[in-house]
Amino acid sequence: STGASSHCQKTSLRVNFEDIGWDSWIIAPKEYDAYECKGGCFFPLADDVTPTKHAIVQTLVHLKFPTKVGKACCVPTKLSPISILYKDDMGVPTLKYHYEGMSVAECGCR
Amino acid sequence: STGASSHCQKTSLRVNFEDIGWDSWIIAPKEYDAYECKGGCFFPLADDVTPTKHAIVQTLVHLKFPTKVGKACCVPTKLSPISILYKDDMGVPTLKYHYEGMSVAECGCR
């Protein structure tokens, strides 16, 4: 997501499943840290934001024509799973050890 | 990158290598279409923006707490190569059929 003046980085984002309506099927945990990618993708793009060639090109174009094109965006580039206890189709509590793509592992400029 | 009120999609972005200072080593082409990902990632995220679970979660949190967290971001999710004629370390013109990651193939919400 877009961010303030700091550079692109992973920050905490506590998510309560009740807040997003998922408590109807996720029994546990009640909340978890999804993390969020926050901050800007400023020139020059550092190695730690693992920029693609396209992101580098877009950053250079933005530098020359800031009104023509936006900066690259700070987004999750790697996600990790969480363990959840959920209600299956029959309403039976079922443990899923690895519910993929729920938490940010790494952020980068894309 | 962030966009206006339209939904996340791929749009044309003509890039002239002279504008970004790459004409010093890329002989041809003089310019190409890098494309750009533009538009918003609005609720509900459509299938065509191939949202990750994290992007869905972040969108739902943004819906409930718009000041706490930003929307997911419209970014390239698949890149494609271009062919370039470039000067190698010895200054010899060399053809690279597939210079990877230079052009947007698909956009999505992340």
Epitope: I27, A28, P29, K30, Y32, D33, S80, P81, I82, S83, L85, P93, T94, L95, K96, Y97, H98, M102, S103 | -
Partner: antibody, heavy 120, light 109 residues
């Protein structure tokens, strides 16, 4: 400091009942999975089952389903493993272990173990 | 018999590199993550590797994990006398957690 402290060694006779405990401290006990693992003398590790203390939700290994009961009392941050009728083959070291916060399949902290001996 | 298969024993001299294999099937290792534990004599197991290749803080980088298909392996470089222990792999199979039979690592000399 995260700690799991298990109850002391037990010597019991076949047919007797038993409840061993595992007290967690130094972390939010209710929001981490607790697993139980058996190790028979000179043998490897066997997963018995797991509990989520917040709602006392449990999942058992098919090998241990109906043989043992896993429970928890979140008010005192303690998990339990119990038998209604012990057998000689239940003689083993029993470990409780805490699942990593978002990964119930990896146990990052372990109790010191409780040795259970069942002999007539 | 364990669901995951490990060699009963491996050995190596101090300073050497040793690997311990763990073989499973598509329903466990093939489709899920692998963890590795070290159990020193007379002590409780200790988590060495989780999610195939991640090390908890405090675990030396001499220990590394990898996974390919339905098999996984633990590599220990710069073998030290204190590495002599039993090593167990584990994975999940549906709702259940499964362990390998364990491998005894002997440090020679």
């Amino acid at each position: 400091e995260v700690q799991l402290v298990q109850s002391g060694a037990e010597v019991k006779k076949p047919g007797e009942s038993l409840k061993i405990s595992c007290k967690g401290s130094g972390y939010s006990f209710t929001t981490y999975w607790i697993g139980w693992v058996r190790q028979m003398p000179g043998k490897g590790l066997e997963w018995m089952g797991i509990i989520y203390p917040e709602g006392s939700y449990t999942t058992y290994s098919p090998s241990f389903q109906g043989q043992v009961t896993i429970s928890a009392d979140k008010s005192i941050s303690t998990a339990y493993l119990q038998w209604s009728s012990l057998k000689a083959s239940d003689t083993a070291m029993y470990y409780c272990a805490r699942g990593k916060r978002v990964d119930a399949s990896s146990f990052d902290y372990w109790g010191q173990g409780t040795l259970v001996t069942v002999s007539s | 018999q364990s669901v995951l298969t490990q060699p009963p024993s491996v050995s190596g001299a101090p300073g050497q590199r040793v690997t311990i294999s763990c073989s499973g099937s598509s329903s466990n290792i093939g489709d899920n993550y692998v963890s590795w534990y070290q159990q020193l004599p007379g002590t409780a197991p200790k988590l060495l590797i989780y999610r195939n290749n991640k090390r908890p803080s405090g675990v030396p980088d001499r220990f590394s994990g990898s996974k390919s298909g339905t098999s996984a392996s633990l590599a220990i470089t710069g073998l030290q006398a204190e590495d002599e222990a039993d090593y167990y792999c584990s994975s999940t199979d549906k709702e259940h957690l499964v362990f390998g039979g364990g491998t005894k690592l002997t440090v020679l000399g």
